[in-house]
Structures are given as C-alpha cells and as structure tokens.
C-alpha cells in the first residue's frame, strides 16, 4: 500500500533560470484532494520551495508570490520552478500527500538534481 513517487534524477535549468520536471505518483486510493510540495534538500537541511493543494481534475494553484507553476493530469504533476540562479543548484524533492478522502497517504520522490548555470553577461558592443 506504500505510495511511490517518481521524478527525474537530473534536470538542467534553461538560460532564463527555469526548470521543469514531472512528478508522478502511484495512488493506492482514489484521492479527490491532493497536496504537492516541492522541497529543497541541501546539507541535510530541508526547506519548502512551494506547495499547492488541488482537487483531482482541477488545476494546481500556487500562491501568487510562488516561484512555482504547474499543471496536473491524472497522477502526473508537471512542475516548473522559475527565477533560479546558480546558487539554487541542488536536490529538489517532490512530496505528494493524498489529503482526502481517508486514508491519508504520503509519498516522497528520490529528488531531482537541478543544475542552474548563470548566463554570461553580454559583452559591451562598441
């Protein structure tokens, strides 16, 4: 009955500091309310990057000031994290919680290593 969560091992952010990945979960039950949280793990410290609760069949809604956006389709969540810089390189973990109806289930992915390379500044043009 354990809930398994899958996510890619590595993702490279684009030149604008945006990284996208899919978080997929094998649901042991028929959930109608799901919470998805993106966590960043660095030096054994875990911090929340963003979180959204959604009703199955509806869109994910992150807070207005969130750096994340996403869409859902069945047991897949397509997550996009924006505004990343080189210092944000790290392991991003997808946590899925089936909040309703009972029973509650939680699953944690192994994490996606996101690499961010700051773009080189444009040379001055004479």
């Amino acid at each position: 009955k354990a809930m398994h969560v899958a996510q890619p091992a590595v993702v490279l952010a684009n030149s604008r500091g945006t990284a996208s990945f899919v978080c997929e979960y094998a649901s042991p039950g028929k959930a109608t309310e799901v919470r998805v949280t993106v966590l960043r793990q660095a030096d054994s410290q875990v911090t929340e990057v963003c979180a959204a609760t959604y009703m199955m069949g509806n869109e994910l809604t992150f807070l207005d000031d969130s750096i994340c956006t996403g869409t859902s389709s069945g047991n897949q969540v397509n997550l996009t994290i924006q505004g990343l810089r080189a210092m944000d390189t790290g392991l991003y973990i997808c946590k899925v919680e089936l909040m309703y109806p009972p029973p509650y289930y939680m699953g944690i992915g192994n994490g996606t290593q996101i690499y961010v390379i700051d773009p080189e500044p444009c040379p001055d043009s004479d």
């Epitope: 966590l39 875990v46 509650y104």
Partner: antibody
C-alpha cells in the same frame, strides 16, 4: 529554535471534558501539519489525531473518534485538543508533535498529563 | 492499518557493545516513510532516523538505519551510557500513523 509547549492537563472525572493547548514558536506554524500522540503510564506511543496545515483535513484514531476534536488557530500559533466523554483508558501523557517536511514527527512538546479518575 | 512489531522487547547489553533492533511491518512501508525514535524516562520521544536510514539533525553517526519493504533495522554501533533507553519505530506513509511497541535497551 523550535518549541512546542503543551498545557491544560489535569485530573478529571470519567465522562467530563478537557481542552489541551500546544503553543508553537520558532517556526512558521501555518506551514506544518500537526499531531497529538499519547502515552499511557508505562506503555508505548499511540497516535491520536492529525490536522493539516490550514485545518481543513483532520484524522482520528478509532479509539477517540467522535469524542476528541483537533483544531488550530494559525493566528495564535496554537494547536488544540478538545477531549469529551473522557474514559479511564484516556489517562496518558499527551504530546503535540510537528509533522516534518519529509514526514516524521521531528519536534515534540514535553507533554501534559491527563488523568481520568473518579 | 499497518502494524509494526519490534523485537526483541528488551535488549540487555554493556556499554561499547553493538545493538541491533528490528522492526517488522504487517504490509509494505515505503523506505522513505519509516522513522526511529529514542525515549528516555520522563522525556518526550526524540527523532533519530527518518526515511529508514537518514539521521536527524544532531544525531551521532553510531546510529544507523537500514531496511526496506517490511523489515527495518536500527543499529547502534557502540553503545554509550546515554543510549540506554526505549526505541520506537514508526511508519508515516499512511493513516493511521502507527508505532511499534518499543524495544528497551538496558544495561547488562
């Protein structure tokens, strides 16, 4: 630093009510799911109830369902446990615990003792 | 409900010895969803291991966790005087959240 402080325990007669509180500090309370766990004298740990970040979702152990109610006030950083129709078997130390980002109960209060006796 | 069974009930060992505690689940537990706690008399439980093998902040490396599926182990490589306590395993992957009945590690 993270701190959880329970209060409200005491001696109460069977059938009576009691409300426990857990004051949280040192973290953003509204971002975390919270739990109550109890421990009868000389016994092991028993999970009692859970409440989600916003208070929307609540789960209870079968042993307390219909008698206990968990709630939270995020503006006051406080977790509550309303215990009604108390029984002798509810006698225990009651701990509030924070549900960590990765799932385990990473911080616990010191506990408050509830004794149900006539 | 996932039932967790710990063995042995009591472990009598001397300081410096190795302690091996077992936790068996009645059904599969995701390896990311098993924790170990330590509890000393008169104190609240303290998180030692989460995700079956990750040490919590500030936990010395003599404590290690292993296992997957239904069988999990907590190992204390060399017992220190402060390690004599009761240890509980817990699954947190589904409700109801359940604990094992505990293993008491006592001084021989």
């Amino acid at each position: 630093q993270v701190q959880l402080v329970e209060s409200g325990g005491g001696v109460v007669q069977p059938g009576r009510s009691l409300r426990l509180s857990c004051a949280a500090s040192g973290f953003t309370f509204s971002h975390y799911t919270m739990h109550w766990v109890r421990q009868a004298p000389g016994k092991g740990l028993e999970w009692v109830t859970f409440i989600s970040y916003d208070g929307h979702n609540k789960y209870y152990a079968d042993s307390v369902k219909g008698r206990f109610t968990i709630s939270r006030d995020n503006s006051k950083n406080t977790l509550y446990l309303q215990m009604n129709s108390l029984r002798a078997e509810d006698t225990a130390i009651y701990y509030c615990a924070r549900h960590g980002w990765l799932g385990p109960f990473d911080y616990w209060g010191q506990g408050t003792l509830v004794t149900v006796s006539s | 409900e996932i039932v967790l069974t710990q063995s042995p009930g009591t472990l009598s060992l001397s300081p410096g010895e190795r302690a091996t505690l077992s936790c068996r689940a009645s059904q599969e537990v995701g390896e990311s969803e098993l924790a170990w706690y330590q509890q000393k008399p008169g104190q609240a439980p303290r998180l030692l291991i989460y995700g079956a093998f990750s040490r919590a902040t500030g936990i010395p490396d003599r404590f290690s966790g292993s296992g997957s599926g239904t069988d999990f182990t907590l190992t204390i490589s060399r017992l220190e005087p402060e390690d004599f306590a009761v240890y509980y395993c817990q699954q947190y992957g589904s409700s109801p959240w359940t604990f094992g009945q505990g293993t008491k590690v006592e001084i021989k």
